[in-house]
């Protein structure tokens, strides 16, 4: 079934209260628009945002008759000229008659007639319609021989696109039959259809159809009011294509148009080819687009690429939201045009600053008040992270110039980086040489602290993205935030007992949840010795605030729960519930702290491990003194097993490399990040290492284990062959740095420094590490592994 | 074909004011905009400001704000442009042109000596 | 004093390919278009080349116009003596917002 032909039987199925053979039309207040009702339309109760009133009427082939209910008689069967009478057409039928068209479709064919309504007569220009009446033999005739075509096409038969020839000079029909259900002929709307005839079809339409000679290109040449577009076309080598053949849809703005354009952005758009096409391309579909076809808001691609909108309110048509054309459907034999009375700018025109919308003004205030937006060359690329208006508290406002230049320089990126190119890991820098840290989780990109909201865009000379929050560098190492802030120092005397102050003073990325002093009150200071004095148990403890990873709050997809792992090696549950971040259904006192080396989250409660059990009395006593939220296990005579430190101690290694090896690039897979299970997956590949090609059996273990690679550093690499030290040194440090990889070669996995060392020397694997044991250098962190 | 005609030379003492017309035939005056430029003797060009046609708005040269008002009247396709305040540096031709703004100045009037001296 | 430097004169023989320069900053030329003017002596001006590049009809192939970064040139070749005048660069200045004019190359021909 065809669009038209859906349409029409919800039309049907909303009216068979009615009786048989009732249809709901949906007629917009105010007007004689009638529409066959859709199922948007219907519960919209709207058409173009115009509130409509139902009227039920008999469904097109069908009539009531007298004292029963809906329409249960079938239309007589006629000729096409009866049938213009049948259906209400009686102008067209007057018109017929007198042109002595009438024998003809009274008579032998198989004709399909478009008959404009009463209405659309009345509605034709009164000197067009006059001149046909002045000269009915041929003018008239002619005009009427171009509503018609010599075959029977009904709706199903009238496809989107096509062109069919009329019978008059065989000047092209241009047919669209739209999703919405509206079949329109040169932009004229069938509003009853498929009234069979005898001897054909009619279709009634809502205007008169003018004959078409000139295409898009003939008609910009000819019209005054369009020169600034036509020769913004010829600027863009544009002008001649809409000479061609094909289905456009032109929005012409006129000359009035370009004149509100603020004069420097047409100056500069019209000094730069590829800003001045993308203009003009803006402005055209590849589809043709009637008018009459647009009920509501729809989104179509340019020929530039991007998208506008097209929507009506009532008779006007809106783009982009905004009322904007003033004549509608020019129908040319290569496409339609509607006269626009504003130009169109497409983001890929615009330079970096123009792409911001309202609600990051306070931002483009700030960057043209200090001085910041004449260093954004219109030539050059940036990327502007630009907080929303509400970011910018009045006491940020109030600071110092300099300060707020400064913050403002943390915004702004040396290159465009758009939405697509963003990774996990990755590093921006700005214009005032801070490095910024992108976080990506499943639903959600962050810059350090701050976090994207929708709306990011590319322009001519860069990007720009919507952030939460200004976005606040970090300074300082896990370690020494924690020192600086006394609510800690209590957790921190326990980290340092418990040798783990190095783990957060290096480099690395860690989500630490770190308890206040609240957490433990009421610690007396031989609880205190008693839980320094089981060194295991407080190692156990104190990782099981740390995650691998940095995992912002406001990164979280609210409401559902993230199951990560901890250091120690239990799970951690977090949730993010109305901008607050529960750690193990716990309330966070405060959330992303960004450190150098991670981020921190503020608890007030102790956190533990459900699945560790206690063996020890009186450390059972202590903790279920400071842990109420859950209930520790006891199981008399267990231990907490050690965590090796060893596995958080970056390595250094020096390797020597004799003679000239041949490298070759072989892509490493991802690492894994996240907690996974099911069935190893296995696969093989060839790695060149020597200069001779070596079969591995890679097994990806999905277990619930977090797999990273220790970050190898080079200290003295020499050479012997054409290959430069420097060179050698670059390509080792760039590729082999990093191996995330299970490699089987007994029980799956990860080689040691010295494992590396030897296998670059042509030497099999000797020493391997456990696989319950976690490695753990400066992380590679996968983008896809993440449990956000 | 597109003409711009001016209104004829003008001698002027400082501080009196001075309106120049420009009469516009062979196009639709009101689809493009009017832009003035004047030329000291013996100097380069100086961009004044811009009207449109359509709609009446201005936009002024800095320099000129406070001094200058460019106007159209639309029934007779011509373009006016007052100056204030005449001082002996504004002496100068002053020319009309047509100002689509993507093509500028495509069209250029024959121009009016204003002379202003004592 | 014009904001777009021009050198003061340039000259070829009949025949010859004459190339006069223009030079101005990041918020005039190096954001905007530059377009040509050719004043004949006694004249008003005329467009000679819109949008860095473009030539309005009528206007003879000989003259070609091209910019990069902050500076732009027009070239007339095939010199003729039909060619001697003044010619103007012009652009849109962002921070003045004002069209700017050059100083004014006179091009003779020998």
């Known amino acids: 079934n065809s669009y038209y032909d859906k349409v029409l039987a919800h039309s049907r199925i909303r009216g068979r209260d009615q009786g048989p053979n009732v249809c709901a039309l949906q007629q917009i207040l105010g007007t004689k628009k009638k529409y066959f009702s859709s199922c948007k339309n219907w519960y919209q109760g709207a058409i173009c945002g115009k509130k409509t009133t139902v009227l039920y009427e008999c469904c097109p082939g069908y009539m009531r008759m007298e004292g029963m209910k809906g329409c249960p008689a079938v239309m007589p069967i006629d000729h096409v000229y009866g049938t213009l009478g049948i259906v209400g057409a009686t102008t067209t039928q007057h018109y017929s008659d007198v042109s002595k068209l009438r024998e003809e479709i009274e008579g032998k064919g198989s004709y399909t007639y478009f008959a404009p309504s009463n209405e659309a007569w009345e509605n034709l220009d009164s000197d067009i319609r006059r001149g046909l009446e002045n000269n009915v033999n041929v003018e008239l005739l002619n005009a009427l021989h171009s509503h018609m075509v010599n075959k029977r096409m009904l709706t199903k038969d009238l496809k989107h696109g096509m062109v069919i020839p009329s019978m008059y000079n065989n000047l092209g029909l241009f047919i669209n039959h739209y999703p919405n259900g509206v079949v329109t002929v040169n932009c004229a709307r069938v509003i009853h259809g498929n009234q069979i005839a005898t001897n054909g079809v009619v279709h009634v339409i809502d205007r008169v159809l003018t004959q078409i000679g000139t295409s898009i290109q003939d008609f910009l040449e000819a019209e005054d009011d369009l020169s600034s577009f036509r020769a913004a076309a010829i600027t863009s080598d544009l002008l001649e294509s809409l000479g061609r053949d094909g289905h456009f849809t032109l929005f012409a703005p006129t000359n009035e148009a370009f004149e509100k354009l603020p004069r420097g952005v047409l100056e500069r758009i019209m000094g730069d080819k590829v800003a001045s096409e993308a203009l003009m391309k803006y402005h055209i579909l590849n589809t043709l687009q009637c008018s009459e076809a647009i009920t509501g808001g729809a989104v179509f691609e340019t020929m530039e690429g991007n998208t506008i909108e097209i929507g009506c309110e009532g008779d006007s048509i809106s783009i982009n939201g905004i009322k904007m054309v003033n004549k509608k459907d020019i129908v040319t034999k290569n496409g339609v045009i509607h006269l626009i009375d504003e130009v169109l700018i497409p983001d890929s025109a615009k330079q970096v600053i123009e792409l911001a919308g309202k609600q990051q003004t306070t931002f483009t205030d700030l960057v043209a008040q200090l001085g910041l937006a004449s260093s954004l060359k219109p030539d050059g690329e940036y990327t502007l992270l630009a907080p929303v208006n509400n970011a910018f508290s009045d006491d940020t406002l109030s600071m110092d110039q300099r300060l707020l230049k400064l913050i403002l320089q943390n915004h702004i990126l040396k290159v465009k980086v758009g939405l697509s190119d963003l990774y996990n890991g990755q590093i921006l820098e700005t214009i005032g040489g801070k490095q910024l840290r992108v976080f990506v989780y499943r639903t959600a990109i962050c810059i350090e602290n701050s976090c994207m909201v929708r709306g990011s865009k590319q322009g001519r000379n860069g990007a720009i993205h919507i952030f939460r929050e200004i976005i606040q560098p970090a300074e300082k190492s896990l370690h020494d935030k924690l020192r600086q802030d006394k609510r800690f120092s209590i957790f921190l005397s326990l980290l340092e007992a418990a040798d783990l102050k190095d783990l957060l003073t290096q480099p690395g990325d860690w989500t630490l949840f770190a308890p206040t002093n609240d957490a433990f009150k009421g610690m007396t200071s031989e609880e205190r010795e008693l839980l320094i004095g089981d060194k295991n148990a407080l190692q156990n403890i104190i990782l099981y605030h740390l995650t691998p990873g940095v995992y912002i709050g406001k990164g979280f997809e609210p409401g559902v729960t993230n199951i990560l792992k901890t250091t120690q090696g239990s799970k951690i549950y977090l949730k993010g519930v109305n901008e607050t971040l529960l750690v193990n259904e716990l309330k966070s006192k405060e959330s992303d702290i960004m450190t150098t080396n991670g981020v921190i989250h503020v608890v007030d409660k102790l956190l533990y491990p459900a699945d560790i059990p206690v063996g020890n009395d009186q450390l059972l006593e202590l903790l279920n003194k400071l842990i109420k939220y859950i209930q520790i296990k006891f199981v008399r005579g267990s231990t907490f097993k050690e965590i090796p430190m060893t596995v958080y101690r970056p390595a250094m290694t020096k390797i020597q490399i004799e003679g000239d090896p041949d490298f070759r690039l072989i892509k490493e897979g991802e690492t894994v990040t996240e907690v996974i299970h099911g069935e190893p997956v296995i696969k093989k590949y060839t790695k060149i290492i020597d200069g001779v090609p070596v079969e591995i059996t890679e097994k990806q273990t999905r277990e619930e284990r977090i797999i990273t690679g220790p970050e190898i550093k080079y200290t003295r690499i020499s050479t012997g062959g054409g290959e430069t030290g420097e060179t050698l040194q670059k390509f080792l440090q760039k590729e082999v740095s990093k191996v995330t990889k299970f490699i089987e070669g007994g029980d799956g996995h990860l080689f040691e420094d010295e494992e590396i060392k030897r296998l670059l020397q042509g030497d099999t694997p000797a020493k391997k590490i456990p696989a319950n044991k976690r490695v753990q250098g400066p992380r590679r962190r996968s983008r896809e592994g993440r449990s956000q | 074909q597109v003409q711009l005609v001016q209104s004829g030379a003008e001698v002027k003492k400082p501080g009196a004011s001075v309106k120049v017309s420009c009469k516009a035939s062979g196009y639709t005056f009101t689809s493009y905009g009017i832009s003035w430029v004047r030329q000291a003797p013996g100097q380069g060009l100086e961009w004044m400001g811009w009207i449109s046609a359509y709609t009446g708005n201005t936009n002024y040269a800095q320099k000129l704000q406070g001094r200058v008002t460019m106007t159209t009247d639309t029934s007779t396709s011509t373009a006016y442009m007052e100056l204030r305040s005449l001082r002996s540096d504004d002496t100068a031709v002053y020319y009309c042109a047509r100002d689509m703004l993507v093509v500028p100045f495509d069209y250029w009037g024959q121009g009016t000596l204003v002379t202003v001296s004592s | 004093q014009s904001v777009l430097t021009q050198s003061s004169s340039a000259s070829g023989t009949p025949g010859q390919t004459v190339t006069v320069s223009c030079s101005g900053s990041?918020?005039?030329?190096?954001?905007?278009?530059v377009n040509w003017y050719q004043q004949l002596p006694g004249t008003a001006p005329k467009l000679l080349i819109y949008s860095n590049d473009q030539r309005p009809s009528g206007v003879p192939d000989r003259f070609s116009g091209s910019k990069s970064g902050t500076s732009a040139s027009l070239a007339i070749s095939g010199l003729q003596s039909a060619d001697e005048a003044d010619y103007y660069c012009?652009?849109?200045?962002?921070?003045?917002?004002?069209?700017?004019f050059g100083s004014g190359t006179k091009v003779t021909v020998l």
């Open positions: 990041s918020s005039d030329i190096g954001s905007n278009r």
């Open positions: 012009a652009a849109w200045d962002d921070s003045l917002s004002t069209y700017v």
